[in-house]
């Protein structure tokens, strides 16, 4: 389906508002340090050019690819070399190498200040004064901090952001109305960003076969009444959408996502009974709703898998003739029967089945060799079941903060070379699995927990790839996508690690501690805990608990004192000395 002008095609398909939003997101994700005004200028220039192409597709440069047009535009930025260093070298390359170069320079942890939320009245004034600029600023700030954010979904977040201000800036108590909505958007946005980052990592590091396998498993759980052929079609289309978005082709991605939503809504009867309410919604909401739709009910009386996948005389013929399709069918059949399993577990089972066939179909008696293949699945199933059970028990016993601390200690002992801020961020997020998943019924716990942990551990992998410090982390991150979580779970105390020298400065605190929010206080304490474990990796739980309890008492005491700073100055060294003695 070729068009004389790709930019005109996408402008017409998407409409001006979405076109401009997506171009702004694309530019902000590539040039993460550029000021807002610079990006707005570039977007306006691209939009004006697109309009000339809509008017006349044969006009000069309208036949150029989007990568060429956007790359040329990005390369006009005057301060490219000063701001981005070697990224400026991308501009000397031709497409498609230039775009690949830009993609490689996306920074998952950009050195940007945390977003500070102004007073509600200040925000409402800004919203009323210039709504368009206010919303563009939101897209820009989120996109530059999350360079792999799923662009069409970010437009949906922006629409919700706009709706929140439109409603709450009229309310009697603006803050009571607005702040919970903004908190929800922030938390959902961070989760959405992390989930998409795993999809992109899956595609970029492990290839589209890995992504397709993930999608077959997940869509088969969601749509157990759909035939394999239907699921395969959805998987192919979904893979194209995410490949485009992860590759920076945001206009094509958004356009194809809209087409996929249209297709699903036109074919509900052969997909799922749960799509109805999604399909009545406007585009952005509809696509979001379809992505989040609950699992349909499983068909009654699904037959045993053994007949076709173990007992049949044709198992090896199927495997030899159409390996990926046959394994895809197996994965589809297993997943639609097991909404209670995590996608990662389902993928491990498919991998185990594949390995068995690879071995047995070359054996003298293949059937005899693979006859017990389903029995081999049992330990693979029990491992995450036991892990979820044990960790939920620990979470219920400790509560979220102390559960996070247990994970901080556990992971610092496993990989002490990892930077303290990364260990704190990742362990805090791992700890959130408790509140998110442990309250769910048994049948939903494992898919919730393990698939969430995969997303969090991907963040560790992405940050570690930028600054590699641990061979163990590299190994767990690169060897197998589906075995990442079991790989990290299996890591023990790193015996080769040389403990970090004690630095009193790390454990010196000031009165500013008292004015921090509860979350910020927790982060400070957890940072100290990681440093403590790095200093004494063999410290027992009891020793660490004693030090942390003393720390909490010391902070509480000084924050109640009349002269807080003097208290910290006097009590701090005593706390450090007592801690060193306790850990000796």
């Amino acid at each position: 389906d070729t068009h004389k002008s790709e930019v005109a095609h996408r402008f017409k398909d998407l409409g001006e508002e979405h076109f401009k939003g997506l171009v702004l997101v694309a530019f902000s994700q590539y040039l993460q340090q550029c000021p807002f005004e610079e990006h707005v200028k570039l977007v306006n220039e691209v939009t004006e050019f697109a309009k000339t192409c809509v008017a006349d597709e044969s006009a000069e440069n309208c036949d150029k690819s989007l990568h060429t047009l956007f790359g040329d535009k990005l390369c006009t930025v005057a301060t490219l070399r000063e701001t981005y260093g070697e990224m400026a070298d991308c501009c000397a390359k031709q497409e498609p190498e230039r775009n690949e170069c830009f993609l490689q320079h996306k920074d998952d942890n950009p050195n940007l200040p945390p977003l500070v939320r102004p007073e509600v009245d200040v925000m409402c004034t800004a919203f009323h004064d210039n709504e368009a600029t206010f919303l563009k600023k939101y897209l820009y700030e989120v996109a530059r901090r999350h360079p792999y954010f799923y662009a069409p979904e970010l437009l949906f977040f922006a629409a919700r952001y706009k709706a929140a201000f439109a409603e709450c800036c009229q309310a009697a108590d603006k803050a009571a109305c607005l702040l919970p909505k903004l908190d929800e958007l922030r938390d959902e946005g961070k989760a959405s960003s992390a989930k998409q980052r795993l999809k992109c990592a899956s595609l970029q590091k492990f290839g589209d076969r890995a992504f397709k396998a993930w999608a077959v498993a997940r869509l088969s759980q969601k749509f157990p009444k759909a035939e394999f052929a239907e699921v395969s079609k959805l998987v192919t289309d979904l893979t194209k959408v995410h490949t485009e978005c992860c590759h920076g082709d945001l206009l094509e991605c958004a356009d194809d996502r809209a087409d996929l939503a249209k297709y699903m809504c036109e074919n509900q009867d052969s997909i799922s009974s749960k799509l109805k309410e999604c399909c009545d919604k406007p585009l952005l909401e509809k696509s979001h709703c379809l992505a989040e739709v609950e699992n349909d009910e499983m068909p009654a009386d699904l037959p045993s898998l053994a007949a076709d996948y173990v007992e049949s005389k044709d198992v090896c013929k199927n495997y030899a003739e159409a390996k990926d399709v046959f394994l895809g069918m197996f994965l589809y059949e297993y997943a639609r029967r097991h909404p209670d399993y995590s996608v990662m577990l389902l993928l491990r089972l498919a991998k185990a089945y594949e390995a068995t066939l690879e071995k047995c179909c070359a054996a003298a008696d293949p059937h005899e060799c693979y006859a017990k293949v389903f029995d081999e699945f049992q330990p693979l199933v029990e491992e995450p079941q036991n892990l979820v059970k044990q960790n939920c028990e620990l979470f219920e016993q400790l509560g979220e903060y102390k559960f996070q601390n247990a994970l901080l200690v556990r992971y610092t002992k496993k990989v002490p070379q990892v930077s303290t801020p990364t260990l704190v961020e990742v362990s805090r997020n791992l700890g959130k699995v408790g509140a998110k998943c442990c309250k769910l019924p048994e049948a939903k716990r494992m898919p919730c927990a393990e698939d969430y942990l995969s997303v969090v551990l991907n963040r560790l992998c992405v940050l570690h790839e930028k600054t590699p410090v641990s061979e163990k982390v590299t190994k767990c991150c690169t060897e197998s996508l589906v075995n990442r979580r079991p790989c990290f779970s299996a890591l023990e105390l790193d015996e080769a690690y040389v403990p970090k020298a004690f630095n009193a400065e790390t454990f010196t605190f000031h009165a500013d501690m008292c004015t921090l929010s509860e979350k910020e206080k927790q982060v400070k304490k957890q940072t100290a805990l990681v440093e403590l474990v790095k200093h004494k990796p063999k410290a027992t739980k009891e020793q660490l608990k004693g030090v942390m309890d003393n720390f909490a008492a010391f902070v509480e005491k000084c924050c109640k004192a009349d002269d807080k700073e003097a208290c910290f100055a006097e009590e701090g060294p005593k706390f450090v000395a007592a801690s060193q003695a306790a850990l000796a």
Partner: nanobody
């Protein structure tokens, strides 16, 4: 176990049309390869047409352009639309199924068979 039952056979004039149906029971067969074979009096059973899970069809040269195979997975059924019938199409038509990703063309590859339905083309 899969049970197959054909229907739709009968007497038809040359140039006429018939639609054969095959209903499967016992388990869903949407991912199975399904096929039609035929056996004329005193002859070997021969391949007519097959369809795979993707609804990709293959045909014997003798029926290409005249016969169309299709399936309705919701009804767990297979069909054969036969147009421009000739006297040499007279035979007992059998429906067959097997769990294969690639639809085979040889009868020995199929595990499940119907009892057949007679098609007679005569003026």
């Amino acid at each position: 176990e899969v049970q197959l039952v054909e229907s739709g056979g009968g007497l038809v004039k040359p140039g006429g049309s018939l639609r054969l149906s095959c209903a499967a029971s016992g388990r869903p067969v949407s991912n199975y390869a399904a096929a039609w074979f035929r056996q004329a009096p005193g002859k070997e059973r021969e391949f007519v047409s097959a369809i795979n899970w993707q609804k990709t069809a293959t045909y014997a040269d003798s029926v290409k352009g005249r016969f169309t195979i299709s399936r309705d997975n919701a009804k767990n059924s297979l069909y054969l639309q036969m147009n421009s019938l000739r006297a040499e199409d007279t035979a007992v038509y059998y429906c067959a199924a097997v769990f294969r990703v690639v639809a085979p063309k040889t009868q020995y590859d199929y595990d499940y068979w119907g009892q057949g339905t007679l098609v007679t083309v005569s003026s």
